[in-house]
Each structure stands twice: as structure tokens, then as C-alpha cells.
């Protein structure tokens, strides 16, 4: 429980202003009324409070809003946002992109990835889906933040906004997120010509299934090795040596550099050594000639 002290009459706070920077922690606790603070939140960020003083102000707001802050307060948090935990943010309901922008700006340069991820999640929930305006805000103010959303949230992304997503926005996306985004991208770019389509779909290919990779191998796309290394292991394993060669084109030589790394290493283990030898790259670890490959998973599925 909080240790209660009485506010000295001469320290009574009638408005939130610069005089408060001279208040000790105990004086702020005793003299600043949370309801007054909330009503004058727009003044707080202009006052150079110490981190200790900001802690007190946060606790005051927590006292007033045990179920989470209303957006009228969140909008004006400013540097107080740096004091928020993901658990605090999870209680919020945020719909305004102005609020999102303001807090993304504050978080820049601070280690707040968990808080930002939770904030974006609350915005998506508050707005009902990740609409184009939200996506545009994220790409402008927080490149890479799109990938902080859970696959469940990303599932609400309409294909129409995929075109606004830049390759760098997907750099930190994991396989589960790309699994969700890839079908949307495929739908969004389906009417584009081969080369244009590949440029657009490339950042999303970490979510592509084997059959789509096989189809791409027939289109002379010359996939760079960085993209290949981000493909799903399960999608790459069934590809033949010839298909990988066609998929990578002149970049096939890069397989030698990556032969110890997944998915290249796992793919090599699945190929016949004599097929690998046709590449002339000296890749080792394939199935020796004369060995019979039994796919037990197929037999299990049949029984």
C-alpha cells in the first residue's frame, strides 16, 4: 500500500505547470491530484520532469484509471509513454492514428519494441482491422513495425494494402507472419506480368508453398540467395536440383557459400549426390548413388 503524506498547504497544486519540477517525489505523491493531471495532460510533455517524477505521474494515472487509460490521456502521454509496460498498454483502446504517430515518435531511439508491438496491436483491435491508413502510418513512422503484429492480427490485412508494404517493412517478419501475408500478396499482385510480379512478391516469399516455388522456377526469375535463404524449409526440401537451379539462375553458385546453413544444408541432404554434382559446385552430403529412398511418411499416411 502507498505511504500517505499530507500535502503542505503552500505546495497545493492547482494546475500542472513548471513549478512541479521542484517537487520531491513525496510532495508529488501527496499534492498532485490524478484527475487534475488527466484534465491537463496536454501540458505534461512540455515540462522537463525527471524519470523519477514521471514514475509518480504514471502511478497517479494508474490510480485514476485502473482499467486502462482513455485515449484522451494516451494521446498526450509524450515521454510518459516510456514508462509504460506492455501490460499497461494491453488495457488501452486506441483508434486514432494521431495518437499512434505521437507515441511512435516518442519511442524512437528507445528500447521499446515490446511496448510498440502491443500499442500497434491495440490500434488494430481498436480500428477493427489493419487498414490502409494504419499501414501507411506504420511504414512512415515505424518501418518494420508491421512484423510486430501477431499472425492473427495480420490476418485482418486486406490484400488491397499489401501494395503499400515496402521490402524493408518485412525484414523482421517471422515465418508464421509471412505465411499469413504471402497469400494476400499473391492475390494483390496476381494481375502483374512475370518480372514485375516477382519484384513485388519477393519480400513475401518466406510464406510461399512448394508449388509456387516450382512455378516461379519456370519463369526465369533469378532469385537472389538472400531471398532463397528466407524461404520456408518445408517448401524448399521437395524442390529438385533442376528446379533450384532454374529458380536461382546465375545465383546458384551462392549455394556453396551457404551449404552449411538451413535451408540449403537440409535441402542438400535430401538430394541425390549425382544430381548435386551436375551443378559443378562441389556440394557434398547428398544421398550416395545406388541408395534407395524410402519416404516413410507416405507409407504412414496410407496405413
Amino acid at each position: 500500500d502507498v505511504e500517505r503524506t499530507t500535502c503542505p498547504p503552500e505546495k497545493e497544486v492547482h494546475e500542472i505547470d513548471e513549478s512541479l519540477i521542484f517537487y520531491k517525489k513525496r510532495e508529488l505523491e501527496a499534492c498532485v491530484d490524478a484527475a487534475l493531471l488527466a484534465a491537463q495532460m496536454d501540458r505534461v510533455d512540455a515540462i522537463p520532469f525527471t524519470y523519477e517524477q514521471l514514475d509518480v505521474l504514471k502511478h497517479k494515472l494508474d490510480e485514476l484509471y485502473p482499467q486502462g487509460y482513455p485515449e484522451s490521456v494516451i494521446r498526450h502521454l509524450g515521454h510518459l509513454f516510456l514508462k509504460m509496460s506492455p501490460e499497461d498498454i494491453r488495457k488501452w483502446n486506441v483508434t486514432s492514428l494521431e495518437t499512434l504517430k505521437a507515441l511512435l515518435k516518442v519511442s524512437k531511439g528507445h528500447e521499446m519494441s515490446a511496448q510498440v508491438a502491443t500499442l500497434i496491436d491495440r490500434v488494430v483491435v481498436g480500428r477493427g482491422q489493419l487498414d490502409k491508413d494504419t499501414a501507411d502510418t506504420l511504414t512512415a513512422f515505424c518501418p518494420g513495425c508491421l512484423c510486430s503484429l501477431s499472425p492473427e492480427r495480420l490476418s485482418s490485412v486486406p490484400p488491397s494494402i499489401i501494395g503499400a508494404v515496402r521490402p524493408q517493412d518485412l525484414d523482421t517478419c517471422g515465418p508464421r507472419q509471412l505465411d499469413v501475408l504471402y497469400p494476400k500478396a499473391r492475390l494483390a499482385f496476381q494481375n502483374m506480368s512475370g518480372s514485375e510480379y516477382f519484384v513485388k512478391i519477393r519480400p513475401f516469399l518466406g510464406g510461399a508453398p512448394t508449388e509456387d516455388l516450382k512455378a516461379l522456377s519456370q519463369q526465369n526469375v533469378s532469385m537472389d540467395l538472400a531471398t532463397f535463404m528466407k524461404l520456408r524449409r518445408e517448401a524448399v526440401l521437395p524442390l529438385s536440383v533442376a528446379e533450384v537451379q532454374k529458380l536461382l539462375g546465375p545465383h546458384v553458385e551462392g549455394l556453396k557459400v551457404e551449404e552449411q546453413h538451413s535451408p540449403v544444408r537440409d535441402w542438400i541432404l535430401k538430394q541425390r549426390q549425382d544430381d548435386l554434382d551436375t551443378l559443378g559446385l562441389g556440394l557434398q552430403g547428398g544421398i550416395p548413388n545406388g541408395y534407395l529412398i524410402l519416404d516413410l511418411s507416405v507409407r504412414e499416411a496410407l496405413s
Epitope: V2, E15, A38, Q67
Partner: antibody, heavy 119, light 108 residues
């Protein structure tokens, strides 16, 4: 169901003291701002005081500052108003009310207790 | 302190008529912090409108609030017999949290 029940009102002489109580139930008292509002006979409402739930930060109307003290006992879900140096103009029905920080206003009120200051 | 002035002092109207009550503040009040209450004789006040325009739980939609800055309005679109009462505005923008002096809506 939210309930606020005031008690402690009565007749008191000028200069005397009285302590009002307000028993709260049906909501999380320990998380809620509470207020006292009064109404003199035939007159309008006058905000008297409020108190925060955790830090017990207090605020008062100028007319009662230095004479009245608001307090709370969170373990008993009870709000108090200690009234000292009472004057004839303090005669009123005193209401205890719950402050809703989300729907900003006094959303639940007690039935009131009458304080009469007279010689 | 913020002084709230309500007008008119008394409004004499018939059931079914529209009532328009005014609340003027001596200095600007954030609309989030303006509330309206209804009080009937012998009863405690009841919160009608918060945030200048949002109806409190259980309040019929014939009650509506509007305004910003220093001028706020409570409107009752069609007066029902149970609406004849005294109405108060209150600001929570700064301390003390003052009330207006009230507007009595009486049957004509």
C-alpha cells in the same frame, strides 16, 4: 448493485463538529475517487470535496477548506467527512458520490444526510 | 474558480415540447469534463450526460448534450412528464469542481 449509504447527520450548534460516513458497496471502492456534494435547503448543488483511492489526495471547495477533512478507510469501504467549526451556512443535505473517471462525472449518489447547524 | 452560469433560471413548457438549457463557463472547459445532472424533489441527482455529449447508462435518447469551450447545451427533444425537474451542469476540468446554479423545467 452500487450502493452508497450516508450517515452521521443531525443537529449541531455553531462551532461544533460532526463526522459523516458513507458506506459503499457493489463496486471496487479501493480503485475509485469519491466526492462529497452538498445542497442547502431550496438551493443548488455545491461540490465540497473529493479524495483519490490510493494516495488519498484531497481537494476542497474554498468555503470549507481548513474546516472539513475528507478521508477514507479502504479496508471498510467507507468514506468520511469530518466537519469542524460548523457554521449556519453549512446547513445542507450532504451527498456522497462516486466519481467515474472514464465517463467523467458523479455517476452514483447516496440518498443524502441532513446536517443542521443551529443554536 | 470556473463559474458556470445556467440559463434560463426557469423554463415553463408543456409535455411533448422541446427544452433547450444553456450552461456558460467563465473560462474554457474541455468538453470531456462537462457533465449534466437531473434532480427531482426529494431525490439525489442523477448523471445524465458526461463528456458534454455522451449519455450516461440508462438515459433515454431524447436527452442530448452539445457544445465546447465556454458554451454548452442540454436538449430534451420531447418532454415527458417525468422530465420536469431541476438540471445542473458541472465541470471537472479544474478544482473546485463547480456546478451551475440550476435550471428548473416546470410544467406550463
Amino acid at each position: 448493485e452500487v450502493q452508497l449509504l450516508e450517515s452521521g447527520g443531525g443537529l449541531v450548534q455553531p462551532g461544533g463538529s460532526l463526522r459523516l460516513s458513507c458506506a459503499a458497496s457493489g463496486f471496487t471502492f479501493t480503485q475509485t475517487y469519491m466526492s462529497w456534494v452538498r445542497q442547502a435547503p431550496g438551493k443548488g448543488l455545491e461540490w465540497v470535496s473529493n479524495i483519490s483511492p490510493t494516495y488519498s489526495t484531497t481537494n476542497y471547495a474554498d468555503s470549507v477548506k481548513g474546516r472539513f477533512t475528507i478521508s477514507r478507510d479502504n479496508s471498510k469501504n467507507t468514506l468520511y467527512l469530518q466537519m469542524n467549526s460548523l457554521r449556519a451556512e453549512d446547513t445542507a443535505v450532504y451527498y456522497c458520490a462516486r466519481y467515474n473517471a472514464y465517463q467523467i462525472g458523479l455517476d452514483y449518489w447516496g440518498q443524502g444526510t441532513l446536517v443542521t447547524v443551529s443554536s | 474558480e470556473i463559474v458556470l452560469t445556467q440559463s434560463p433560471g426557469t423554463l415553463s413548457l408543456s409535455p411533448g415540447e422541446r427544452a433547450t438549457l444553456s450552461c456558460r463557463a467563465s473560462q474554457s472547459v474541455s468538453s470531456s469534463y462537462l457533465a449534466w445532472y437531473q434532480q427531482k424533489p426529494g431525490q439525489a441527482p442523477r448523471l445524465l450526460i458526461y463528456g458534454a455529449s455522451s449519455r450516461a447508462t440508462g438515459i433515454p435518447d431524447r436527452f442530448s448534450g452539445s457544445g465546447s469551450g465556454t458554451d454548452f447545451t442540454l436538449t430534451i427533444s420531447r418532454l415527458e412528464p417525468e422530465d420536469f425537474a431541476v438540471y445542473y451542469c458541472q465541470q471537472h476540468n479544474q478544482y473546485p469542481n463547480t456546478f451551475g446554479q440550476g435550471t428548473k423545467v416546470e410544467i406550463k
